[in-house]
């Protein structure tokens, strides 16, 4: 806590500018008006303040806004955002996507910090659901964002938002998460034609039930092995050899290299040897 000291004569800051970098911490505390700082927050980023000086500026804003900063200030926090604690952020009410983008930009290139996680949580809760524009923004900054949500949180994602999801956004999702996302994707893409539909739905198929895989097998989709290996074992097991052959097309040749891995291993054990032999790969059930 910086002591309250009078501002020396002639040192009162008429505006936020570069001259302030020469102020000692106590001078900043005494000579910078908090209301002025709040209105000129956009200038702070352009000035090479030390971390100690930024601490003083944060302290002044905290005193001015004990209930939490207004969005007009939050949007221009810049690097001062890195000084905020999750407790500080929980007091905020961030509703503008532009504000969210501005703060995410500050943390760009780093892993998601507790501060960012709190900010996103506040923002999404404020909006009531994870809409397409928000999801677009979040996955652009954090490709693994979607897979960091619990199945319960994912249930608030409207099907329309699924259009914003890229295949790489689902790389780290587990089956429970895909179980939630797959029906939404199916709904979102339902009006697309066969081949276009498959391209879009492919990365969500880890949540697909057997009947949907059987339906896909009738559509000449040629699913690659990487996708097949991510399917739910319980969804793959009931598929016949003929259905798997149709589902994979030329990719069926890759089953041999995967014969010891799930779900291929478990599926092989469920099949009649005569049927497996038709694949021409020497698979042993």
């Amino acid at each position: 806590e910086v002591e309250k000291t009078a501002c020396p004569s002639g040192k009162k800051a008429p505006e936020i500018d570069e001259s302030l970098i020469f102020y000692k911490k106590w001078e900043l505390e005494a000579c910078v008006d908090a209301a002025l700082l709040a209105t000129q927050m956009d200038r702070v980023n352009a000035i090479p303040f030390t971390y100690e000086q930024l601490d003083v500026l944060k302290h002044k804003l905290d005193e001015l806004y004990p209930q939490g900063y207004p969005e007009s200030v939050i949007q221009h926090l810049g690097y001062l955002f890195l000084k905020m604690s999750p407790e500080d952020i929980r007091k905020w009410n961030v509703t503008s996507l532009e504000t969210l983008k501005a703060l995410l930009e500050v943390n760009k290139g780093h892993e998601m910090s507790p501060q960012v996680a709190t900010l996103i949580d506040r923002f999404v809760k404020g909006r009531g659901q994870l809409d397409k524009d928000t999801l677009d923004t979040l996955t652009a900054f954090y490709p693994g964002y979607l897979c960091s949500l619990s199945p319960e949180e994912l249930s608030s994602v409207p099907p329309s938002s699924i259009w914003a999801v890229r295949p790489q956004d689902l790389d780290t999702c587990d089956p429970r998460q895909l179980d939630v996302l797959y029906p939404k994707a199916r709904l979102a893409f339902q009006n697309m034609n066969g081949s276009e539909y498959f391209v879009k739905i492919q990365s969500f198929l880890g949540g697909a039930p057997t009947e949907d895989l059987k339906a896909l097998s009738q559509q000449n989709v040629s699913m690659d092995l990487a996708t097949f290996m991510k399917l739910r074992t319980d969804a793959v097991l009931p598929l016949t050899v003929a259905e798997v052959q149709k589902l994979l097309g030329p990719h069926v040749e890759g089953l041999k290299a995967e014969e010891r891995h799930r779900p291929v291993r478990d599926w092989i054990l469920r099949q009649r040897q005569d049927d497996l032999d038709t694949l021409g790969l020497g698979l042993q059930g």
Partner: antibody, heavy 121, light 107 residues
Framework: QVQLQQPGTELVKPGASVKLSCKAS????????MHWVKQRPGQGLEWIGN????????YYNERFRSKATLTVDKSSSTAYMQLSSLTSEDSAVYYC??????????????WGQGTTLTVSS | DIQMTQSPSSLSASLGGKVTITCKAS??????IAWYQHKPGKGPRLLIH???ELQPGIPSRFSGNGSGRDYSFSISNLEPEDIATYYC?????????FGGGTKLEIK
């Protein structure tokens, strides 16, 4: 040991068809798909397609879909490739090759010696 | 389809020297690349698979490296019998594709 035997040469006239053979021995024929590869004079290798010898199901490189027809005769462990409507562009060496399925879709560990096809009037 | 761009198309080197050939895939092929030596009148001979795994009986003068889209193949201590054309093959996709080939000559 594994062997893929192909006739050395075939000479055919433009517009005709030819059926190239590849006789496999030294392994269970129906446990490995058979692939075909083309090499034009002074050019590189080009994958034509493959066939499941167990059920006779072929897959083609789109470029050869209307040119090549792949078949097998399980009783003689022989794979065939018929080339139709022959032109000078089809003059090439054609190889059959067997994949090894150690990883992914398999690389070719055994090759035939190749059949040199000459299309000329 | 995955395109494989191989370079150079030809090269000349001295006996005992070292040469390096590169293949660039049009997309990530997860190290699923093999290298072949091809001499006239014969079928191609497998040298290396899975980027750097040497086939049994192939001398350690031959080596491979790479990941993602970029791969290389080297021969050190060049010998007269190394005169041949060399090809890369991607097998990350069932529709296999070869590089254009590199013709190796000895100075």
């Amino acid at each position: 040991q594994v062997q893929l035997q192909q006739p050395g040469t075939e000479l055919v006239k433009p517009g005709a068809s030819v059926k190239l053979s590849c006789k496999a021995s030294g392994y269970t024929f129906t446990n490995y798909w058979m692939h075909w590869v083309k090499q034009r004079p002074g050019q590189g290798l080009e994958w034509i397609g493959n066939i499941n010898p167990s059920n006779g199901g072929p897959y083609y490189n789109e470029r050869f879909r209307s040119k090549a027809t792949l078949t097998v005769d399980k009783s003689s462990s022989t794979a065939y490739m018929q080339l139709s409507s022959l032109t000078s562009e089809d003059s090439a060496v054609y190889y059959c090759a067997r994949p090894y399925y150690g990883s992914s879709y398999g690389y070719f560990d055994y090759w035939g010696q190749g059949t040199t096809l000459t299309v000329s009037s | 389809d995955i395109q494989m761009t191989q370079s150079p198309s030809s090269l000349s080197a001295s006996l005992g020297g070292k040469v390096t050939i590169t293949c660039k895939a049009s997309q990530d092929i997860n190290k699923y690349i093999a290298w072949y030596q091809h001499k006239p009148g014969k079928g191609p001979r497998l040298l290396i698979h899975y980027t750097s795994e040497l086939q049994p009986g192939i001398p350690s003068r031959f080596s491979g490296n790479g990941s993602g889209r970029d791969y290389s193949f080297s021969i050190s201590n060049l010998e007269p019998e190394d005169i041949a054309t060399y090809y890369c093959l991607q097998y990350a996709n069932p529709l296999r594709t070869f590089g254009g080939g590199t013709k190796l000559e000895i100075k």
